[in-house]
Interface confidence: low
């Protein structure tokens, strides 16, 4: 399941990955060192009945209709770490590969 | 992240595992051989700022909040398989480990 | 370092407002979430509010909503509490303290500010 | 909301005691609790962060443990500046919930 991508001009209105850039600097989170920004991107779209699942679970889901389930949502199914260089809570500046930072495939669950 | 286990009586409305019985008979599964039915278990709840999230790049998503971003969503973030006994498509018996079958796990992402 | 400084208590009469600010200086603001704790005399510690480093996300205890507003000001680096239809039981001191959510929590208080409800 | 339970809700111990607080949580909530130390008209000093990670500049006799729902402060040589009251804080979900405060006195 290779999952969709999409940019801001699609039409596409199924579960799809949307770049995204995150700029820690807009957030002022200001004990990250770097990388000040980096490509985060993001999952958006509708589920639609048996599109994109990454589970047969959420194809069960669906059928047995328990209450409360709200049916499966678009979110990722991927996901890769990135490596930072920050300041921990003592001031000692930490260089480490952070994980679930990139989303590299959305689907639904 | 240990997630939350509720049951049909629990009044948790943030996100949570809730105890599910998928039974392949009730839904005329007649190809499956074994098991008739199993715990399969599901996700439901709202997902509240930070409450259970999976990644950092929830978080980072919210804070960003682009176009079309739905907010995390309830989703099974820990999924295990089930043995089972079936009939393929060419009608031959296959046991097999089946994944994405159990959920473990609920969380935000 | 770190420091916040309250300033906004004070006597007040059932039914009166007072609004508590908490102004932040020697780390960036606009990064953190921001709560308001409270402490009744010889009681324990009350969460009473929260809100995001963006205001986007805000939240209250029970026994505040709706009669308690927090906002912040982070061109100010400020933060604030007014408190309305005051009662009783809102006599406590008020704190003010930083978020850094995640794994960090709360790390840092202010020096708390007394406000008290009587006729 | 989630519950803390915080216990003994006070101990006499004398300087040079090992002093041990616990909290319960009413559900799982990771390791995302800290143990705070006040004073008589002071604000709140956090003295551990994470369940177990030690705030910057806290001397190294405290320390915590615990994840999910069960969580422990240990003082292991009770110092005379430590009398004091000491609560636990769950910032896992709103609302923020605090333990309801363990008070140390001097035997």
């Known amino acids: 399941n290779l999952g969709l991508d999409c940019d801001e001009h699609s039409s596409e209105s199924r579960c799809c990955r949307y770049p995204l850039t995150v700029d820690f600097e807009a957030f002022g989170w200001d004990w990250i060192i770097a990388p000040k920004r980096y490509k985060a991107n993001y999952c958006s779209g509708q589920c639609e009945y048996m599109f994109m699942q990454k589970y047969p679970h959420t194809h069960l889901v669906q059928q047995a209709n328990p209450r409360g389930s709200a049916g499966p949502c678009c979110t990722p199914t991927k996901m890769s770490p990135i490596n930072m260089l920050y300041f921990n809570d003592k001031q000692q500046i930490i260089y480490g590969k952070i994980p679930g930072m990139v989303v590299d495939r959305c689907g639904c669950s | 992240n240990l997630g939350l286990d509720c049951d049909e009586h629990s009044s948790e409305s943030r996100c949570c595992r809730y105890p599910l019985t998928v039974d392949f008979e009730a839904f005329g599964w007649d190809w499956i051989i074994a098991p008739k039915r199993y715990k399969a278990n599901y996700c439901s709840g709202q997902c509240e700022y930070m409450f259970m999230q999976k990644y950092p790049h929830t978080h980072l998503v919210q804070q960003a909040n682009p176009r079309g971003s739905a907010g995390p969503c309830c989703t099974p973030t820990k999924m295990s398989p089930i043995n089972m006994l079936y009939f393929n498509d060419k009608q031959q018996i296959i046991y097999g480990k089946i994944p994405g079958m159990v959920v473990d796990r609920c969380g935000c992402s | 370092q770190v420091q916040l400084v309250q300033s906004g208590g004070g006597l007040v009469k059932p039914g009166g407002s007072l609004r508590l600010s908490c102004a932040a200086s020697?780390?960036?603001?606009?990064?953190?979430?921001m709560n308001w704790v409270r402490q009744a005399p010889g009681k324990g510690l009350e969460w009473v509010s929260s809100?995001?480093?963006?205001?986007?996300?805000?939240y209250y205890a029970d026994s505040v909503k709706g009669r308690f507003t927090i906002s912040r000001d982070n061109a100010k680096n400020s933060l604030y509490l007014q408190m309305n239809s005051l009662r009783a039981e809102d006599t406590a001191v008020y704190y003010c303290?930083?978020?850094?959510?995640?794994?960090?929590?709360?790390?840092?208080w202010g020096q708390g500010t007394t406000v008290t409800v009587s006729s | 909301a989630i519950q803390m339970t915080q216990s003994p809700s006070s101990l006499s111990a004398s300087v040079g005691d090992r002093v041990t607080i616990t909290c319960r949580a009413s559900?799982?909530?990771?390791?995302?609790l800290g143990w705070y130390q006040q004073k008589p008209g002071k604000a709140p000093k956090r003295l551990i962060y994470?369940?177990?990670s030690l705030q910057s500049g806290v001397p190294s006799r405290f320390s915590g443990s615990g994840s999910g729902t069960e969580f422990t402060l240990t003082i292991s040589s009770l110092q005379p500046e430590d009398f004091a009251t000491y609560y636990c804080?769950?910032?896992?979900?709103?609302?923020?919930?605090f333990g309801q405060g363990t008070k140390v006195e001097i035997k």
């Open positions: 303290a930083r978020d850094r959510g995640y794994t960090f929590g709360v790390d840092y």
């Open positions: 020697g780390f960036t603001f606009s990064s953190y979430s």
């Open positions: 809100i995001s480093s963006s205001s986007s996300y805000i």
């Open positions: 559900q799982g909530i990771r390791n995302d």
């Open positions: 994470a369940a177990s």
């Open positions: 804080l769950q910032h896992n979900s709103y609302p923020y919930t």
